[in-house]
């Protein structure tokens, strides 16, 4: 199983569970369907998971191969600057915004994307394979 | 920073064609979520939303001139663009373009967050 | 459509002193997403309009903390808890939660 604090990386695991994808050391959930920000996040805590925070530059590279233009919830808000949902500050990368309501973060293949937290979107969520310890 | 601009004839003749050019810079109408809308203001009387048109190319009009308007945009040139045909002197009016926000409802919007300065359209004979 | 009410149609006001402007809708204005998409705007003499307020209460970006929405459903409130003198113009309320939007008639605040 997953080692570590609840902001660790997760130890090499086995598998992820049904209809999660396992890249790296990390179980990853693309949703089919479409909620707003705070749905989204539910949705993931709900199993054990977390809206997907990026740790670095590469895994924002792996992960933009599986998507497409369309945008997708990662746990990423603007609440007096953008951080992350483990409270730390996007500092690897820039997030297109120019708007003062536009406080939720999403992603496609192109980039990060502010936009309004209510907008029905795709999500991802993130976890440790059959872990409830280590969320990102 | 962002800016908006609106341009457009100053006076127009009855049963003439209105177009009105807004130009903006500070952001891009390619970007997710991003639209701009066009209101007017006719001398001495409220704000009147006409039209507004999204990043992705949907529009939504009033209904009451909606066999009226044109809305189009060019983003190459960072312009929307709002043809109003059949004008009459009622329909004289300072006209503002504002950038409007998306949250989910195309037909609609909320937070109109920079606006223009407005251009003075006169209908006379 | 959604016909906004204010009221009062005009407000003279002494500096220093508060100020409440009310805007009734003729319908709820909840949206389905949970969110009442009530807005305030400011237009100064020979100005274009501003945003002062989105969704209901919250305030825009440089907006002074004397200016403070609030309401539910159909009534909604503008307060000014000190009026200035930079605060004189016609206010606005809008509806963005139901089509079409909407604009009141607007409140004229002057001083006394």
């Known amino acids: 199983l997953c080692q570590g604090s609840n902001y660790s990386t997760c130890a090499s695991c086995p598998s992820c569970p049904d209809r999660w994808m396992k890249y790296g050391n990390h179980c990853y959930y693309f949703s089919v369907e479409e909620k707003d920000w705070n749905s989204s996040l539910e949705f993931c805590l709900a199993r054990d998971s977390h809206l997907l925070v990026i740790t670095d530059n590469q895994e924002m590279s792996l992960l933009q191969v599986f998507l497409s233009e369309a945008f997708c919830w990662i746990g990423l808000r603007n609440n007096s600057g953008w951080r992350w949902e483990d409270g730390s500050p996007l500092n690897f990368s820039r997030i297109s915004s120019n708007s003062f309501v536009q406080t939720c973060g999403a992603i496609n293949k192109n980039g990060l994307q502010a936009s309004s937290c209510e907008v029905p979107l795709h999500w991802v969520c993130k976890k440790c394979p059959f872990a409830d310890q280590a969320l990102f | 920073q962002v800016i908006l601009k609106e341009s457009g004839p100053g006076l127009v003749k009855p049963t003439q064609t209105l177009t009105l050019t807004c130009t903006f810079s500070?952001?891009?109408?390619?970007?997710?979520?991003?639209?701009i809308g066009w209101i007017r203001q006719p001398p001495g009387k409220a704000l009147e939303w006409l039209a507004h048109?999204?990043?992705?190319?949907?529009?939504s009009y009033n209904s009451a001139l909606k066999s009226r308007l044109t809305i189009s945009k060019d983003t190459s040139k960072n312009q929307v663009v709002l043809t109003m045909t059949n004008m009459d002197p009622v329909d004289t009016a300072t006209y503002y373009c504002?950038?409007?926000?998306?949250?989910?409802?195309?037909?609609?919007?909320?937070?109109?967050?920079?606006w223009g300065q407005g251009t003075t359209v006169t209908v006379s004979s | 459509d959604i016909l906004m009410t204010q009221s009062p149609l005009s407000l003279p006001v002494t500096p220093g002193e508060p100020a409440s402007i009310s805007c009734r809708s003729s319908?709820?204005?909840?949206?389905?997403?949970?969110?009442?998409?009530l807005e305030w705007y400011l237009q100064k003499p020979g100005q274009s309009p501003r945003l002062l307020i989105y969704?209901?209460?919250n305030r825009f970006s440089g907006v002074p903390d004397r200016f403070s929405g609030s309401g539910s459903g159909t009534d909604f409130t503008l307060k000014i808890s000190r009026v200035e003198a930079e605060d004189v113009g016609v206010y606005y309320c809008f509806q963005g939660s139901h089509v079409p939007p909407t604009f009141g008639a607007g409140t004229k605040l002057e001083l006394k």
């Open positions: 969704k209901v209460s």
């Open positions: 504002a950038r409007t926000i998306y949250y989910g409802n195309y037909l609609t919007f909320y937070a109109m967050e920079h």
């Open positions: 319908q709820n204005i909840v949206h389905s997403n949970g969110n009442t998409y």
């Open positions: 048109i999204w990043w992705n190319d949907d529009k």
């Open positions: 500070g952001f891009s109408l390619t970007t997710f979520g991003m639209g």
